[in-house]
């Protein structure tokens, strides 16, 4: 019968979420181990009845209106391990009478986020918590941390302080937390990290502050454990000095004001003048550091949304483990990776939305690169084998450039064209909006693409055989918005083609699909089709799932194949109700309403019906 009471009970878990409760129920099973009272209207937490449930391990009191904690309210809960008081009103003075939370001997995680707690008050609220591993103080009103803020928490490993208004962290504020490994200080008001000395810390989130400088403490023998550092959305002017952080694996510096130096440092001591754009760029490790090569373990580096105009050769030199590099939304005009073994592990390189005009990739550089994003640049005359040299390249996005593809080996094409043939690893290529005028025969020979997007190249001429060699591999082809009147592509030969986008052209005929193919989605919107005869479309009947036809001058008569699809409902034809067709009298009606006799009346026999 317990399914009919307000709280849901399964095993030893009781959920009383969002029931409008004003107090903790007295009638729950006495051996309850997990109790969720979130989203109610509890205003005070009293030892009775909460203390009735002495077996509790997990207690969720979040999103209530709690402003009063009776002294010793949690005292009887000797097994309590997880306590959430998030999103309550603990900042009101009554919450703190006689010792706040009191001792929490076995609690390992405590969530006090969203309580408008301010600095002095927090110290009165937090009691002894010798087992505490995880503490969230996010979304409060803390302005400073002192060496008294976190006391009696020797086991604390994860501390979340995001979304406060922290401006000041006193020296030694975290000294009493010898096991702290994860620290989230994002969305605060910090302006400078001048003496980072938390050697045991592994994860540090400093995103969304106003940090202008990040400096590690000058401890020559220090062995910093930091592997994950997030400094995105700050006000860094220079790449920070990270030579003391040899274990760094993830580094996010996006959305700053970073410029990289254009020349070598001016002095020999490794302290560089900010006017030169240097902040001890990670080119040499401190003498006492065992690693010898800073950032040599870095796997992920995000420098997007900065003001970088140039990447010095030396900058990439030590990034021997890097797998993901994001340099999008900067001011790069050129990018070079010419050296043998440069960025040997890099799998993804995002250079999109810069001002790139030149790109020089050495014959044996970037040997692991799988994804190269170059959309939104100004690339024009590239060395012909720029991409053919990338032995592992699978995905290439060149949208919004001015790249002209060469033809096949027999028809190389003009100077400045780029070869896309013979790239045996390439699977996905976007050449959208490149002002391509002519796609030459054999352009993709021996490049087994599965996805090719040639959309938004108005006036594109597709030469016979331009897509030759793709018949056995291509699954997605987009030719949208090219003004094509005739399609010089023998589409029925593309046996793997699943999605075909021919929208926004001027096509009025399609080749005949007489044999069964794989096509599932066909987009013909905004073309000049009046008829889709069954003789041409018959081969699609087994595979086609979606057909888009809006914006075509469809004829009401002679479209029996299409009418049959509408009535059978096997193919999802877009906007069925609004698919308009015209009689010879120019009268417009919904195609789904046309009957055979409507066509016979005017002497137009519907041959397909």
């Amino acid at each position: 019968h317990q399914d009919k009471v307000p709280c849901k009970m399964v095993d030893k878990k009781v959920s009383c979420q969002v029931l409008g409760l004003l107090q903790v129920p007295s009638v729950l099973p006495p051996d309850t181990e997990t109790l969720d009272l979130s989203g109610n209207q509890l205003r005070s937490i009293l030892a009775s009845p909460l203390g009735f449930y002495t077996a509790l391990r997990h207690l969720d009191l979040s999103t209530n209106e709690i402003s009063f904690l009776q002294p010793g309210a949690f005292q009887a809960l000797t097994h309590l391990e997880h306590l959430s008081l998030a999103h309550n009103r603990l900042a009101m003075a009554t919450a703190l009478s006689a010792g706040g939370l009191g001792p929490l001997p076995r609690v390992t995680s405590l969530d006090l986020s969203g309580n408008s707690l301010y600095s002095g008050l927090l110290e009165r609220l937090l009691g002894e918590a010798p087992s505490l591993h995880t503490l969230s103080l996010a979304e409060n009103s803390l302005t400073r941390l002192t060496r008294h803020t976190f006391r009696d928490m020797p086991a604390l490993e994860q501390l979340d302080l995001h979304s406060n208004v922290l401006m000041d962290i006193e020296d030694g504020a975290f000294e009493g937390l010898p096991r702290l490994t994860h620290l989230n200080l994002s969305r605060n008001s910090l302006t400078c990290i001048s003496d980072f000395s938390l050697q045991q810390l592994r994860v540090l989130d400093l995103s969304c502050n106003s940090i202008e400088a990040f400096q590690t403490a000058s401890q020559p023998q220090a062995e910093f454990q930091l592997t994950w550092l997030d400094l995105r959305e700050n006000k860094l002017l220079h790449f920070p000095d990270l030579a003391a952080l040899p274990r760094l694996i993830y580094l996010n510096l996006s959305n700053n004001l970073i410029r990289l130096p254009t020349g070598p440092p001016q002095d020999s001591k490794g302290i560089h003048a900010p006017s030169e754009g240097w902040s001890a760029l990670p080119l040499s490790a401190p003498s006492g550091n065992a690693s010898g090569r800073p950032l040599s373990q870095l796997l992920n580096l995000d420098l997007s949304y900065n003001e970088i105009e140039l990447i010095p050769d030396s900058f990439l030199e030590h990034l021997t483990s890097l797998c993901f590099l994001n340099l999008s939304r900067n001011c790069l005009r050129t990018f070079e990776a010419r050296r043998l073994g440069s960025l040997p592990c890099l799998m993804l390189l995002d250079l999109s939305h810069n001002a790139l005009e030149t790109l020089e990739l050495g014959a044996r550089a970037l040997g692991s690169l799988r994804t190269l994003l170059l959309q939104g640049n100004a690339l024009r005359d590239l060395p012909p084998y720029t991409f053919a040299n990338l032995a592992s390249l699978q995905r290439l996005n060149l949208q919004g450039n001015r790249v002209s593809p060469c033809g096949g080996p027999d028809e190389p094409g003009p100077s400045g064209c780029v070869a896309f043939s013979g790239i045996t690893s390439l699977r996905s290529l976007s050449l959208v909006d490149n002002e391509i005028e002519l796609l030459r025969a054999g352009a993709f020979l021996h490049t087994p693409l599965t996805e090719l997007d040639l959309s938004s190249n108005p006036g594109l001429e597709v030469a016979t055989g331009a897509l030759g060699g793709l018949e056995a591999s291509l699954e997605v082809l987009a030719l949208q918005g090219n003004g094509l009147m005739v399609l010089q592509v023998d589409l029925p030969c593309f046996i793997c083609l699943k999605r075909l986008n021919l929208a926004e052209n001027r096509l009025s005929h399609l080749p005949a699909w007489t044999q069964a193919v794989s096509l599932e989605v066909l987009d013909l919107r905004n073309n000049s089709f009046s008829l889709l005869p069954g003789s041409a479309m018959g081969g699609l009947e087994t595979s086609l799932r979606r057909l888009y036809l809006q914006g075509n001058p469809l004829s009401c008569c002679g479209n029996g194949w299409l009418a049959a699809q509408l009535h059978q409902g096997r193919v999802d034809v877009d906007a069925t109700q609004d698919l308009i067709c015209r009689f010879s009298s120019q009268e417009e009606v919904s195609l789904s309403h046309v009957r055979p006799e409507d066509c016979e009346k005017g002497g137009l026999k519907n041959i397909n019906l």
């Epitope: 009919k4 009471v5 007295s26 009638v27 729950l28 099973p29 051996d31 009735f52």
Partner: antibody, heavy 116, light 107 residues
Framework: QVQLVQSGAEVKKPGSSVKVSCKAS????????MHWVKQAPGQGLEWIGR????????HYHEKFKTKVTITADKSTSTAYMEFSSLRSEDTAVYYC?????????WGQGTAVTVSS | DIQMTQSPSSLSASVGDRVTITCRAS??????LNWYQQKPGGAPELLIY???TLHSGVPSRFSGSGSGTDYTLTISSLQPEDFATYFC?????????FGSGTKLEIK
């Protein structure tokens, strides 16, 4: 099926003590409160108190706090109520009943007669 | 302690009648109200818990309603086996307390 079986009727002298037992079966003993209820002859029902069998924590009606001790033995799934310093007004039928939201199963009752 | 005032204390009715028993708490008990039936010589039996939820096996002619301080037990069509004493009980706040009972007799 759920069953609560209470010990037999008792006749006691004033000032003495009595311990009534209630053996539970057919459910998880520790998952329900065990309540004790008094019914004097021709009278209504009076809640004495309850115990959480898992922890042994008991709650009493103020009126019975000094006279009654409720205990439970998890190993035998048995609850006990001990009445001390018996007086004639303690003559009644005493019921054990399991229950969280409602007392859904009751023992058959134990009649305790206090007489000199 | 929360006082539970039950009325009427006794009631005569005939088979087939519709009968209503009320229970008033001295303060809001948030629907934590139960109804019990007791026949002579027997232990009480739970009929309804949490104001309106029928205990398993209880006939649907029994129903409960109410909120705040005022609660009602209704028997829509009295059957011969329904003649007994009925008690309400609040379980919102310790100590749990019973009403004084309503004795339902054959007219």
């Amino acid at each position: 099926q759920v069953q609560l079986v209470q010990s037999g009727a008792e006749v006691k002298k004033p000032g003495s003590s009595v311990k009534v037992s209630c053996k539970a079966s057919g459910y998880i003993f520790t998952s329900y409160w065990m309540h004790w209820v008094k019914q004097a002859p021709g009278q209504g029902l009076e809640w004495i108190g309850r115990i959480a069998p898992n922890s042994g924590g008991a709650h009493y009606h103020e009126k019975f706090k000094t006279k009654v001790t409720i205990t439970a033995d998890k190993s035998t799934s048995t609850a006990y109520m001990e009445f001390s310093s018996l007086r004639s007004e303690d003559t009644a039928v005493y019921y054990c009943a399991r229950g969280n939201y409602g007392m859904d199963y009751w023992g058959q009752g134990t009649a305790v007669t206090v007489s000199s | 302690d929360i006082q539970m005032t039950q009325s009427p204390s006794s009631l005569s009715a005939s088979v087939g009648d519709r009968v209503t028993i009320t229970c008033r708490a001295s303060q809001d008990i948030s629907n934590y109200l139960n109804w019990y039936q007791q026949k002579p010589g027997g232990a009480p039996e739970l009929l309804i818990y949490y104001t309106s939820t029928l205990h398993s096996g209880v006939p649907s002619r029994f129903s409960g309603s109410g909120s705040g301080t005022d609660y009602t037990l209704t028997i829509s069509s009295l059957q011969p086996e329904d003649f007994a004493t009925y008690f309400c009980q609040q379980v919102n706040t310790l100590p749990f307390t019973f009403g004084s009972g309503t004795k339902l007799e054959i007219k």
